[in-house]
């Protein structure tokens, strides 16, 4: 288990960080510097770090079930379940569901009435007692109702010229009835003697186009449950068809653009709105099967076989029988239908919030186990043969208050889950002593919950009217930082900084903004290690004897003297016993200056002044001309040539000294002064 | 100016305990760090052990569980208590303390542990 937590100052906080978390309550249990966040960890981090095993909370998921005892027949148990959640962990009970003998069945029996149904129309007129006699068999309480359809009553459905909307059949002396899309027939009776009156009226009718519109039908039977009479029961639509089915978009073809709205609509018995609905899809039929507990039989003909078999992978709890060509079939059809349809479970649950998952292990009778799928399925269920389901309910955050409920498709027992949040930590109520917070707060789980007025780890700050963001202002940079750097806390308005996981690593600064270890490194080491330097804010500040930007270098100058043991000439400075040159002076000992400009423009007027007492500088020189030394013996250096301020040539030298704009100069007796014309 | 005075140094017998103080006089500044260095004859100066203004604190190994760094921000003034002595902690040990803008380093103060 591991415990990734994120600013996290409350017990509450911690265990929704994740089933790893855990929180130590003991007192004192923070050192200075450390945050709250530290009590959250996981339990062998907090054991490790001195927390006392029942100072640890730790809340888990779980399940408490209740049966209910009243009522009739029960299929599935427990019938009610309360779940406590924390989040990301799993609470997990067991569903057991007992397949009864003889449970009560109604069976609408929804008939294609194109007019290649004709022979198998004949057959069904004559099919009531048979019906009611195989349902009897199989329960004590079977009831039987019946519907038809054709298609939508516009092109290219069926045809619209006046005389084929009257008869559409082929044969015209054939009697036949206008097309329609639903007509509900029979409400579920268990008077077989009415099927037989009710079926015998019926007349053949007829379309255009191949499919026909059977969801609309369908989606009409599902939809209208009071029409139809349907009971609390196993609900079972057979449909019998030999073609295939128009679905959502096919209205297109009619100009029929507004979506079903999965409403029941019939008005006489009649889908009158028809053509202002398109067909249903089949994920939307299936839904409403699913809603309603119906399950479909399609009994279709043989080439229409594979077609339906693609629509029962969609459709939950929903089988296929093979129809013979006039439906001679269909009683023994049913049979075999009903005993598969009722020897497969599936265990689902309704519509849920993104925040809770369910998953389901199903644990089925003939030894086959399924794990961890999105519902719960097991076939070959055999009557009084208990099977066992363990449902799994995970919540990803701290949830409201909320129920779900579980059913077994296709029947109508249900199973009511109650889901709470597990999120409060029921710490010790160590002490209603407030001393421990300064007498201005109380404590909750080991730590101090202010009161107004009062913050810090002990509540020993007095706000003083300063609200808040005040004080937190203060612990920020600027408008654009976190406080403290995200670092520390803020404790009357001045960062306490958290101490450090890292070896070696304190974090401090104004604003928790500096560490120990982020600097340059030498030697594998920051600054050099701990003899050499120390990581201030992100640059090394060395020890006496070191410097360098990772106090790489022992603290001496000897590479840097020139041979009067002035350092660097005077001209630079010596870093790492290497000079560091002012622009333009060379390596290695900055003494010369290739590229500087001639000095001898400069300091005419001070060796005018310094041999002659003459010029601009005459009462002033040694103020004008601090860096000039005169010599009375010729000098090594740059030789020059200016003119004065009387226009006169003077030679003289300049020799550089150790040091910037310092200079001997040796200056020629004579001046070369030319006569101007008479 | 501001200067760092420590005292609390002495000859000790090995297993003994000593607390060392440093103060700052002068201006009242904010020190972000604080720690005690050693330099033992002919060796380099060494970390002992450093504080945050938070009270976070390192310490170098050899003196883990024995010596024990802490502050009084109010006073400005930088303790030491070491415990269990060893002949090895012999040298003399200095107080350094940093602002945002000066490195400051005290005179040192001898510590001898004798065995």
């Known amino acids: 288990q591991e415990c990734t937590k994120f600013k996290v100052s409350s017990c509450r906080e911690c265990i929704e960080s994740g089933p790893g978390c855990t929180w130590c309550q003991k007192l004192n249990f923070t050192g200075p510097g450390d945050p709250d966040s530290i009590r959250c960890d996981t339990r062998p981090q907090l054991l490790m770090r001195g927390c006392a095993a029942d100072d640890i909370m730790d809340p888990t998921s779980l399940a408490e079930t209740q049966e209910d005892h009243n009522g009739g027949q029960k299929q599935l148990s427990p019938q009610k379940v309360t779940l406590y959640l924390r989040p990301g962990q799993a609470a997990a009970f067991n569903v057991t569901f007992r397949r009864a003998k003889g449970y009560p069945i109604d069976l609408y029996y929804l008939m294609d009435l194109s007019y290649s149904m004709l022979d198998d129309l004949r057959n069904v007129k004559k099919l009531g007692g048979d019906l009611l006699r195989a349902l009897n068999e199989i329960t004590e309480s079977g009831r039987i109702g019946f519907g038809s359809f054709v298609d939508k009553t516009v092109l290219p459905f069926v045809n619209t010229h006046p005389d084929k909307l009257r008869n559409p059949c082929p044969n015209k002396e054939k009697e036949c009835q206008p097309p329609f899309a639903f007509r509900h027939v029979l409400k579920l009776t268990n008077n077989s003697n009415q099927f037989q009156t009710e079926v015998g009226k019926q007349l053949i009718s007829g379309n255009l186009d191949a499919p026909e519109g059977g969801l609309d039908a369908m989606m009409q039977v599902a939809a209208c449950p009071e029409e139809i009479g349907w009971r609390n029961v196993t609900r079972l639509l057979v449909f019998a068809t030999d073609d295939g089915f128009h679905f959502a978009g096919d209205g297109k073809l009619g100009a029929i653009l507004t979506p079903n709205d999965g409403r029941c609509h019939l008005e006489d018995n009649l889908y009158k709105r028809s053509n202002e609905f398109d067909y249903p899809s089949v994920g939307q039929l299936a839904h409403k099967l699913a809603e309603n507990n119906i399950q479909p039989i399609f009994a279709v003909t043989s080439r229409m076989v594979k077609t339906y078999e693609k629509l029962t992978e969609i459709i939950p709890k929903s089988a296929v029988g093979e129809l013979s060509e006039d439906s001679s079939n269909v009683v023994h059809l049913i049979k075999n239908a009903y005993n598969k349809l009722s020897s497969r479970v599936f265990l689902d649950h309704n519509a849920l919030p993104d925040t809770l998952k369910v998953t389901y292990d199903s644990f089925c009778s003939n030894g086959v186990t399924h794990r961890n799928q999105p519902r719960g399925d097991c076939d070959g269920v055999q009557i009084n043969v208990p099977i066992t389901f363990q449902v799994k309910v995970t919540a990803t955050e701290c949830i409201q208050e909320q129920s779900f409920v579980i059913r077994a498709l296709g029947f109508t027992d249900i199973v009511t889950v109650q889901v709470l949040p597990q999120c409060e930590c029921r710490c010790r109520d160590q002490s209603r002593d407030r001393s421990l917070c300064h007498g201005k707060g109380f404590l909750e789980c080991g730590i101090c919950r202010c009161d107004t007025g009062y913050i810090g780890k002990n509540c020993e700050c007095q706000t003083q009217g300063r609200s808040s963001q005040e004080l937190e202002g203060s612990c920020r940079k600027d408008n654009n930082s976190i406080i403290c750097s995200g670092l520390g806390d803020c404790v009357c308005g001045q960062c306490l900084c958290h101490t450090s996981d890292v070896p070696g690593k304190l974090i401090y600064g104004q604003y928790c903004e500096c560490d120990t270890i982020n600097c340059e490194r030498y030697n594998g080491q920051v600054c050099g290690g701990p003899g050499r330097g120390l990581c201030f804010c992100g640059k090394c500040r060395c020890h006496p004897g070191f410097e360098g930007s990772a106090c790489q270098c022992e603290r001496t100058t000897e590479g840097c003297l020139n041979p009067r043991r002035v350092e660097c000439s005077g001209r630079g400075r010596c870093r790492c016993n290497v000079c560091e040159c002012h622009s333009g002076y060379q390596l290695p000992l900055c003494q010369e200056c290739p590229g500087c400009p001639s000095p001898c423009g400069k300091y005419i007027s001070c060796a005018e002044c310094l041999k002659f007492e003459k010029g601009p500088f005459g009462k002033n020189c040694s103020a004008a001309c601090p860096g000039l030394q005169l010599s009375n013996n010729p000098v090594k250096g740059r030789t020059c040539k200016e003119r004065d301020s009387e226009g006169c040539w003077v030679a003289y030298t300049l020799e550089q000294q150790d040091g910037m704009d310092r200079y001997l100069i040796y200056v020629d007796e004579s001046r070369e002064c030319v006569a101007g014309p008479n | 100016e501001v200067q760092l005075v420590e005292s609390g140094g002495g000859l000790v017998q090995a297993g003994g305990s000593l607390r060392l103080s440093c103060a700052a006089s002068?201006?009242?500044?904010?020190?972000?760090?604080m720690g005690w260095y050693r330099q033992a004859p002919g060796k380099p100066r060494d970390l002992v052990a450093l504080i945050t203004s938070s009270g976070s604190a390192n310490y170098a190994d050899s003196v883990k569980g024995r010596f024990t760094i802490s502050r009084d921000n109010a006073k400005n003034t930088l303790y030491l208590q070491m415990n269990s002595l060893k002949p090895e902690d012999t040298g003399v040990y200095y107080c350094?303390?940093?602002?945002?803008?000066?490195?400051?380093w005290g005179q040192g103060t001898q510590v001898t542990v004798s065995s």
């Open positions: 002068g201006s009242r500044l904010r020190f972000e760090l």
């Open positions: 350094n303390a940093h602002t945002y803008t000066d490195n400051l």
